[in-house]
Amino acid sequence: MRRGPRSLRGRDAPAPTPCVPAECFDLLVRHCVACGLLRAPRPKPAGASSPAPRTALQPQE
């Protein structure tokens, strides 16, 4: 059975995640969870330097 990569590296993703495509990687607790448990990252306001909490790495396959 062909196994493709688990996730493709997006421009903002530093590395592939260990999650299957059905899940998302929680950067806060550093493991895979259902994507609905994460908050989507919000656009940073001008001058903001800290990342939004609980963002996910899960580029489209």
Epitope: R3, P21, C35, A40
Partner: antibody, heavy 118, light 113 residues
């Protein structure tokens, strides 16, 4: 070819226990999440939970409806994973399926039937 | 838990007809970070186990005929069979995997006239 074969079903009395098995072939067992789903006769499907892959430490998620009574585990050396069911009730009577999780529930076994009755 | 509601519960159509069935979720299944809807469709033929047809609401699983199309976003989803064949006799289930516990709809039973 991906193949999932469930076994271990049968008749059990209320309050009893049963362990279902899912034998896996056709893919690297440690690299996939594996799930259990059940279907009471003539009714809809119910997700019971899954166990993640090696990269995720074989962690588990459960449906609250069975959490505490049902336990999912795996024996990677034999390419088998299990559903341990305790304190069984009449409403646990169903066909139990194992399924490989990737994009969703990608591949399913043929199912094994559990009947809980006195 | 997210409640999945399917309609109609059953329908009977002739071979060659177009069929649409609906699935509604009690909350949005769209994850805005990647614009994926975490919704799948399964086909369960009589006496068989379910088979994945569609994932991410609209992506056809490998080997699934192109007469099956999934569409929709957020809370409203549709499975369309463009030209029904006799072999499509089955119950069709939608399922959300946006959050735990994963939940299924009650199914739509497709009968052939």
């Amino acid at each position: 070819e991906v193949k999932l074969v469930e076994s271990g079903g049968g008749l059990v009395q209320p309050g009893g226990s049963l362990r279902l098995s899912c034998a896996i072939s056709g893919f690297t067992v440690t690299a996939y999440y594996m799930s259990w789903v059940r279907q009471p006769p003539g009714k809809a499907l119910e997700w019971l939970g899954f166990i993640r892959d090696k990269a995720n430490g074989y962690t588990t998620e459960y449906n609250p409806s069975v959490k505490g009574r049902f336990t999912i585990s795996r024996d990677n050396s034999q390419s088998i994973f299990y559903l341990q069911m305790n304190t069984l009730r009449a409403e646990d009577s169903a066909t139990y399926y194992c399924a490989q999780v990737r994009r969703a529930l990608d591949y399913w076994g043929q199912g094994t039937t559990v009947t809980v009755s006195a | 838990d997210i409640v999945m509601s399917q309609s109609p519960s059953s329908l009977a159509v002739s071979v060659g007809e177009k069929v649409t069935m609906s699935c509604k979720s009690s909350q949005s299944l769209l994850y805005s970070s990647n614009q994926n809807n975490y919704l799948a469709w399964y086909q369960q033929k009589p006496g068989q186990s379910p088979k994945l047809l569609i994932y991410w609401a609209s992506t056809r699983e490998s080997g699934v005929p192109d007469r099956f199309t999934g569409s929709g976003s957020g809370t409203d989803f549709t499975l369309t069979i463009s030209s029904v064949k006799a072999e499509d006799l089955a119950v069709y289930y939608c399922q959300q995997y946006y959050t735990y516990p994963y939940t299924f709809g009650g199914g739509t039973k497709l009968e052939i006239k």
